[in-house]
Amino acid sequence: LIIGFGISGRHSITVTTVASAGNIGEDGILSCTFEPDIKLSDIVIQWLKEGVLGLVHEFKEGKDELSEQDEMFRGRTAVFADQVIVGNASLRLKNVQLTDAGTYKCYIITSKGKGNANLEYKTGAFSMPEVNVDYNASSETLRCEAPRWFPQPTVVWASQVDQGANFSEVSNTSFELNSENVTMKVVSVLYNVTINNTYSCMIENDIAKATGDIKVTESEIKRRSHLQLLNSKAS
């Protein structure tokens, strides 16, 4: 969490951003909140990016003002206009790309004063893994697949029964570059699996951590997966 203040105490407002991550090929949100004002027409929101000459986005007098917008962001940005009055200056970014990563500044002017806060925005790819029993294999084998990751993640297997066990000797992980030549498909195979046990395939890079669980019994197979973004620090 980054909390920024205006320069002079009497004319400063608190602006708060949260470091976040964008999944390339999706819309992303850069979070920013501020002390609200009672009049929308008195609020100015400016988003800037380090190393970019033009503005990322500007909203003032109750509407978008995009005449100074940098070409890199043309047609891609929006604030949530109906939420500005309650102090939400978050930015929506369409079709996030790797090049959108960097340091952004959320700069706010209201009738109470000015304030700003920086935000570190990371971009990459992350997806939910799916763990299945590989019936084609000669022994009981699990196959963990996740379609899109970047940067290259680590893959670790764990088991409920053998907690703390190191499965690196009985697993094999491969990374296959996807057709757009950025993201990669992750495939990890775990051998010598025992029945009546829950196995977890954990995929992690510096942006996200995802886990796929599978419980194999004589009568059924249960699956569960979840994904968590890392480094969501507020400023």
Epitope: D64, G75, A78, N178, E180
Partner: antibody
Framework: EVQLVESGGGLIQPGGSLRLSCAAS????????MNWVRQAPGKGLEWVSV???????DAADSVKGRFTISRDNSKNTLYLQMNSLRAEDTAVYYC??????????WGQGTTVTVSS | EIVLTQSPGTLSLSPGERATLSCRAS???????LAWYQQKPGQAPRLLIY???SRATGIPDRFSGSGSGTDFTLTISRLEPEDFAVYYC??????????FGQGTKLEIK
């Protein structure tokens, strides 16, 4: 040259299925938001479905559960699988690339007629 | 659900005249996500304006877009014979993800 070419349209009975294809050239489908948009005879444009660069999909309520958008990255091709077709699905179906600057590339359209 | 209402439904003008087409949204739309398209009979739509006011590649400067919030305008400063067509506004980002207006038919008077 940046281009989209649709195929797969035709006459189909109510309740039937059809798969539309849209072959892209000059750009990579998986880096863009790719859409299907339709136009019923004498009517306006109606958005049908999108597949994001990430592979996630969304669709209009009118086709959810019946139509599925997908892509084959190796063939650089977009698809629309249409099941449980109804008379009101009769339209010209366009595929369109939504680049950063709006739907800037459109195919020529393929006609789907649902009739008994 | 965002509804885009275009007016007038039909606009009858002569070549050389100025055309003003309106697009009103039922709730606020980001200027970045508002586009205008032209469609001629038997043809696919063509992107004219994106980001409410930026001309797409190859679009003549007689076409201009303006507006913000809920009110957007497409202006054709001097009508050429090839400009007579149907025009659609479109928004991105709300539910449904993409919405088109019902269209304005620009016809020769």
């Amino acid at each position: 040259e940046v281009q989209l070419v649709e195929s797969g349209g035709g006459l189909i009975q109510p309740g039937g299925s059809l798969r539309l294809s849209c072959a892209a050239s000059g750009f990579i489908v998986s880096r863009n938001y790719m859409n299907w948009v339709r136009q019923a005879p004498g009517k306006g444009l109606e958005w049908v479905s999108v597949i994001y660069g990430s592979g996630r999909t969304d669709a209009a309520d009118s086709v959810k559960g019946r139509f599925t958008i997908s892509r084959d990255n190796s063939k650089n091709t977009l698809y629309l699988q249409m099941n449980s077709l109804r008379a009101e699905d009769t339209a010209v179906y366009y595929c369109a690339r939504d680049g950063d600057y709006g739907m800037d590339v459109w195919g020529q359209g393929t006609t789907v007629t649902v009739s008994s | 659900e965002i509804v885009l209402t275009q007016s007038p439904g039909t606009l009858s003008l002569s070549p050389g005249e100025r055309a003003t087409l309106s697009c009103r949204a039922s709730q606020s739309v980001s200027s970045s996500y508002l586009a205008w398209y032209q469609q001629k009979p038997g043809q696919a739509p063509r992107l004219l304006i994106y980001g409410a006011s930026s001309r797409a590649t190859g679009i003549p400067d007689r076409f201009s877009g303006s507006g913000s919030g809920t009110d957007f305008t497409l202006t054709i400063s001097r009508l050429e014979p090839e400009d007579f067509a149907v025009y659609y506004c479109q928004q991105y980002g709300s539910s449904p993800l993409y919405t088109f207006g019902q269209g304005t038919k620009l016809e020769i008077k």
